[in-house]
């Protein structure tokens, strides 16, 4: 793992005054265990809309590491195999919580933070706009 | 807000001895005040591979609601708007992390959850298997 | 259109054994994590096995670990239940159907199999 050096501002563990702060124990419990993480590992190629996934890091976010859904087309695959631009490949995106250290570089010390990522891509009617 | 009532038995937030405990501060930072939380409310209707919103709440976790996805149907919508069964509606998954308070009904004190959500629904080529 | 048919169950004594079996037709059966879902009288409809696209894992109601074990055969487009060391508590009428965890499957629901379990 990378080594965050120390910030010397860094709030004390103990301070009664730090804002709206809670305890938060890092050992992850993972309620997964009863799935099977490669059942959806081949959609993103596999879809009508297609996606390809890149690799977001951040070493000051836990999770460090992030990946991001992006379409490959604007439409979406045909029976065919082409690219059918009467349809549109659209990012299925979903708020989720990280942690964000704050301040900087401070190893036992996160603020809550939301941000947004794309999850994979679906692929949808288009809104036809009528011109009069 | 649900009220948690205080278990006698919560660590006290100063405890040095808390396993891999970490500050965190609960004001929330959110980074997407750029995006249209909108732009993608109506996909789960227009999908070739729509889905349903459940919500799931739970007053132990940190975000206490998550809307979890349920795809409508086995097959796909084709351009008749009928259910194609030779194709698949599958959904994209994603394991998040999540606050859960423990000892329960702590108001200061949570570990780190790993859980899998459904965010929405894709449609996928099936995988055929050839039998001899 | 999606067809989900149940057969196997009866009466058994406890301690017995029975071997459900449920045909799927009208969807590719090899693309779906399968289950079996059981209702008794004046309960609601809960989840008992669960068995993953290929068979590659299971996933058991603590209520039957270790007794029951769901399997599948995709050539068959069939999903098997087999209850050992049945109790009175195991009586309900059992179903299959896709994974209601990730589905609306409400519109499949096929007929069930009786399973009595008398002491």
């Known amino acids: 793992g990378i080594t965050i050096p120390r910030n010397p501002g860094c709030p004390n563990s103990e301070d009664k005054n730090f804002p709206r702060t809670v305890m938060v124990n890092l050992n992850i419990h993972n309620r997964n265990t009863n799935t099977n993480p490669k059942r959806s590992s081949d959609y993103y190629n596999r879809s009508t809309s297609p996606w390809n996934l890149h690799r977001n890091e951040d070493p000051e976010r836990y999770p460090s590491v992030i990946w991001e859904a992006k379409c490959r087309h604007l439409g979406c695959i045909n029976a065919d195999g082409n690219v059918d631009y009467h349809m549109n490949s659209v990012p299925i995106q979903q708020e989720i919580l990280v942690l964000r250290r704050e301040p900087p570089h401070c190893p036992n010390s996160f603020r809550l933070e939301k941000i947004l990522v794309s999850v994979g891509c679906t692929c949808v009617t288009p809104i036809v706009h009528h011109v009069a | 807000g649900i009220t948690i009532p205080r278990n006698p038995g919560c660590p006290n937030s100063e405890d040095k001895n808390f396993p891999r405990t970490v500050m965190v501060n609960l004001n929330i930072h959110n980074r997407n005040t750029n995006t249209n939380p909108k732009r993608s409310s109506d996909y789960y209707n227009r999908s070739t591979s729509p889905w349903n919103l459940h919500r799931n709440e739970d007053p132990e976790r940190y975000p206490s609601v998550i809307w979890e996805a349920k795809c409508r149907h086995l097959g796909c919508i084709n351009a008749d708007g009928n259910v194609d069964y030779h194709m698949n509606s599958v959904p994209i998954q994603q394991e998040i992390l999540v606050l859960r308070r423990e000892p329960p009904h702590c108001p200061n004190s949570f570990r780190l959850e790993k859980i899998l959500v459904s965010v929405g629904c894709t449609c996928v080529t099936p995988i055929v298997h050839h039998v001899a | 259109e999606v067809q989900l048919v149940e057969s196997g169950g009866g009466l058994v004594q406890s301690g017995g054994s029975l071997r459900l079996s449920c045909a799927a037709s009208?969807?590719?059966?090899?693309?779906?994590?399968m289950s079996w879902y059981r209702q008794a009288p004046g309960k609601e409809r809960e989840l008992v096995a669960t068995?993953?696209?290929?068979?590659?894992?299971?996933n058991y109601a603590d209520s039957v670990k270790g007794r029951f074990t769901i399997s599948r055969d995709d050539a068959k487009n069939t999903v098997y239940l087999q209850m050992n060391s049945l109790k009175p508590e195991d009586t309900a009428v059992y179903y299959c159907n896709v994974d209601w965890k990730w589905y609306e499957v409400d519109d499949y629901w096929g007929q069930g199999t009786q399973v009595t379990v008398s002491s």
């Open positions: 068995v993953e696209i290929g068979g590659s894992s299971t």
């Open positions: 009208g969807f590719t059966f090899s693309s779906y994590a």
